[in-house]
């Protein structure tokens, strides 16, 4: 299936150029998408190209501008929020980044009714997060490690925490396990609906062994980083959550929600805290060994003025092949009845399905099915349920918004997007305005990124919001790869795969073969997305065939691929990456003297693997950021696949899995390492470890570190990468420069 | 460019009432958010009460219970009825989107002034 055919006729041929690494690098072919930040059913803000806030109302098609440029460059202000009850923005400046999602910033008040910044009992700067109760304008923020409450912008804080310490205690946010690996945000304080209750955890990270590398700046003395960062098997960070009534802080204090008693009898994490009203939340807990959640259902006693979980509201989530859940266990979403609710998880048949829970797990109605996945459930209103899978034409590595009418008997289920823009558009998100009023659909491709906004009752197109104009007439004189999507079958395993094929492809020449390889679990690389970077340029400018593959341990196809590495990383995931390229081998055109296999963190450890595999089919490879050992990375990350490195659970694959044990495979490739010294995710001592096991071993290799960069390798250290990595293949591939 | 007039105002003794109105020209009123603003002498500019496209309102601390605010579609007509004045709700009362457009798009406003 050919998605992005070229362009290229022969009267045109002395007109069209391919791509440059330059383009790549410059960001020459960036696209843009459009997401409404919504305020009502029918209005939305949008920061516009000259930075505007402007107010756009659907129904009357108007818009004006809240808030100017003038005034957001009064204080640097990269980002704003308004207050619900539209009476202040927050702007954010000095942004800090810190981990992945965390960063630090100055906040400043500005008062729409007066035009004027609030003055006096001004914010502490820098803040490590701030946001508004989602009705009136009441404010909550995060300074130093504890937790701040403001009944309006000029008010004295109210302190709601006082132990918060670097390093040791972190209230109201996660510290970097749990923001890395289990909440996906800088944040871990939750208000209730109304505003009444805000709800907060605090991680205790005293007994947590610290990572340490330098970080070598400009100054005389390197500084050192510290973080407290559990690797696998090692001591744990410490949870609670507490609720506090932020209408009378003072009157009892932050209360401690309960943890589930099956739950408490081991170690555990929290996962994840959904209010349902003002006066009943949702808290999702799992055991340490990650094949068991359990979802707490807690109610406000106002007679005790406590929280209380009542058993009967406990409901466990099991896996008896793998883990719970995909990458992370589902959420919930609840109906209108404040009790039941809809949630995604494993039916009796290993595909992830939409489940409506009234009383039980075990009397659960499943609402979607067959062999492919419901991934996201967007919104649940009174007669409709939208959500995305990968269901329309078999395509696991498509996504499709598609609506349940719960209202009626029997549901029916309608795609909303699947014959939309079906050649350019098949791998979409969504963005639903309160009472799924009105809709932004974000299309990624296979073609040009399109935005639309949509009717919430009858799904037609208002307008487009973005459309890439500028992208599709500046790529109309580019020679762009040919991509196509297809599936191998191997011993009752589907691998599917994307190949990417220079303009002028021919098949009876023979090409040089890269493969592109990530690999994780309940990771997908093979999709339908729009994509012009680095493997793009190499396919258009240097003739390779670059070749992406979904390997068991991959996303979306149901839990027999899913859980097929489970306490086995490092086996499968590298056997159907060769398996692959022997089949591409088959198919005649690829050159089986030059190819190589390159990936970044955890591609970078199966492209290790793969390289030291002794198959003799790679040439060359490249590892970024690799993992080497699993007794290195993130404990949650790392336990949830593995279990723990210890004798009497699954130590021995731990060793048996390390990057370091092949060093002596590595002696008939070339390998090209590459790190950053400040990577604070997969650290250093990972690609430390591999240098020295093949320097032991007296294996040549070729290296390159980054000062001072971090997981990312972002900035200049992105071009020096690219160019660092395309000098090599082009080496390996014997390719003149 | 939709036009918007105040009108109402006047003279009144404290614990007394008066209905504010502002006529919206422009169409389909019903979803847009509205808003009441003052200006009391010497002081700046606040929100009273607003009211989204939804009909959901929002008023400040200090008129909560006394003022409500309202909306006629068919006449394209905003109404801040304000019942149990107090001498400190004497100000210029103007009426904008909610919240309001940026620059001078502030009307003439209505006086309301409240005698002890």
């Known amino acids: 299936i050919v998605l992005r055919p070229s362009r290229v006729h022969n009267s045109e041929e002395n007109t069209m150029r391919a791509l440059t690494l330059k383009d790549i690098l410059n960001g020459t072919f960036s696209y843009k998408t459009f997401f409404p930040n919504w305020i009502s059913g029918q209005e939305y803000l949008h920061q516009s190209a000259d930075n505007n806030i402007v107010l756009y109302n659907i129904e009357t098609g108007q818009s004006y501008t809240i808030l100017s440029n003038r005034t957001m460059k009064s204080v640097n202000a990269s980002n704003y929020g308004l207050s619900p009850d539209r009476q202040f923005v927050y702007l954010e400046s000095d942004y800090s980044k810190l981990w992945r999602y965390s960063y630090t910033a100055t906040y400043y008040i500005y008062d729409l009714s007066n035009g004027e910044f609030v003055r006096g009992n001004e914010l502490p700067r820098p803040i490590q997060y701030l946001c508004w109760s989602p009705v009136g304008s009441k404010l909550a923020y995060v300074y130093q490690n504890n937790i701040y409450l403001k009944q309006r912008p000029g008010d004295p804080p109210f302190q709601i925490t006082f132990n918060g310490r670097e390093n040791k205690i972190f209230n109201g946010i996660p510290d970097w396990v749990y923001e890395e690996e289990m909440l996906a945000t800088k944040y871990a304080l939750w208000w209730s609906p109304n505003g009444k209750f805000l709800a907060y955890a605090e991680f205790n990270d005293t007994d947590i062994p610290v990572i340490a590398y330098s970080y070598y700046g400009d100054e005389q003395y390197p500084r050192t980083i510290n973080i407290p960062y559990p690797k696998a098997g090692a001591k744990n960070p410490v949870v609670r959550i507490f609720i506090i009534d932020t209408t009378y802080p003072a009157y009892v204090g932050p209360q401690e929600v309960p943890v589930p008693a099956m739950i408490a009898s081991s170690d555990y994490y929290f996962s994840w805290l959904t209010w349902v009203t003002d006066e009943r939340v949702c808290l999702q807990w799992l055991k340490r060994v990650q094949n068991v959640s359990v979802l707490s259902i807690c109610d406000f006693r106002e007679d005790w003025q406590t929280w209380d979980c009542p058993k009967t509201q406990e409901h466990i989530e099991e896996s008896r092949t793998g883990w719970a859940g995909g990458f992370f266990v589902s959420t919930p979403v609840f109906s209108y009845d404040a009790i039941s609710y809809y949630k995604i998880f494993s039916d009796k048949d290993g595909y992830k399905h939409i489940h409506y829970i009234k009383d039980t797990v075990e009397n659960a109605i499943q609402i979607t099915s067959g062999k492919w996945e419901a991934i996201n459930i967007f919104r649940v209103t009174q007669d409709s349920l939208f959500y995305s899978s990968n269901e329309f034409e078999e395509y696991p590595g498509r996504r499709n918004i598609y609506r349940i009418s719960i209202g009626s008997y029997p549901p029916s289920k309608k795609c909303v997007t699947c014959h939309l823009r079906k050649e350019r558009c098949q791998y979409y998100t969504a963005s639903f305005s309160d009472y799924a009023k009105y809709y932004a659909l974000v299309c990624y491709g296979p073609g040009i990124p399109i935005s639309t906004l949509h009717d919430g009752r009858t799904d037609q197109e208002i307008k487009i919001l973005e459309e890439n104009k500028e992208l599709e007439n500046a790529l109309k004189n580019i020679q762009l790869p040919k991509e196509e999507i297809k599936k191998l079958e191997v011993d009752e395993i589907t691998l599917w795969y994307k190949m990417i094929l220079p303009p002028q492809f021919d098949r009876s020449k023979k090409y040089p073969l890269l493969i592109q390889v990530y690999g994780g679990p309940c990771s997908q690389s093979v999709r339908s997305v729009f994509a012009v970077n680095w493997i793009s340029y190499l396919a258009s400018k240097e003739g390779m065939v670059i070749a992406l593959v979904d390997g068991r341990g991959t996303a979306f196809q149901g839990d027999k691929l899913l859980y097929a590495v489970y306490r086995k990383l490092g086996v499968y995931e590298v056997e159907d990456q060769i398996t692959a390229v022997r089949k591409f081998i088959e198919m005649g055109f690829i050159d089986e003297k030059r190819i190589a296999i390159w990936g970044w963190s955890y591609g970078g450890y199966v492209s290790s693997l793969a390289l030291a595999s002794g198959t003799g089919l790679f040439k060359c490879g490249i590892a970024v950021a690799p993992v080497s050992s699993w007794e290195y990375y993130a404990s949650v990350y790392t336990e949830r696949f593995m279990g723990l490195p210890t004798k009497d659970d699954n130590l021995e694959h731990y060793k048996n899995s390390t990057v370091m044990a092949r060093a002596e495979y590595f002696r008939n490739v070339d390998y090209l390492l590459i790190h950053g010294t400040a990577d604070d995710n997969v650290h250093f001592q990972n690609s430390a470890q591999i240098a020295k096991a093949l320097v032991n071993a007296q294996v040549d290799f070729q290296a390159m570190w980054y000062s001072d960069q971090n997981h990312g390798l972002s900035g200049l250290s992105t071009n020096h990468l690219y160019t660092h990595m395309t000098h090599f293949l082009k080496q390996c591939f014997s390719l003149s420069d | 460019q939709v036009q918007l007039q105040e009108s109402g105002g006047g003279l009144v003794q404290a614990g007394g009432s008066l209905r504010l109105s502002c006529a919206v020209s422009?169409?389909?009123?019903?979803?847009?958010?509205m808003g009441w603003y003052r200006q009391a002498p010497g002081k700046q500019r606040e929100l009273v009460a607003g009211?989204?496209?939804?009909?959901?309102?929002n008023y400040a601390d200090s008129v909560k219970g006394r003022f409500t605010i309202s909306r006629d579609n068919g006449k394209n007509t905003l109404y801040l009825q304000m019942n149990s004045l107090k001498p400190e709700d004497t100000a210029v009362y103007y009426c904008?989107?909610?919240?309001?457009?940026?620059?001078?798009?502030w009307g003439q406003g209505t006086q309301v002034t409240v005698s002890s």
């Open positions: 904008n989107f909610y919240p309001p457009i940026v620059g001078d798009y």
């Open positions: 422009g169409r389909l009123f019903s979803t847009n958010a």
């Open positions: 009211i989204t496209g939804g009909d959901r309102s």
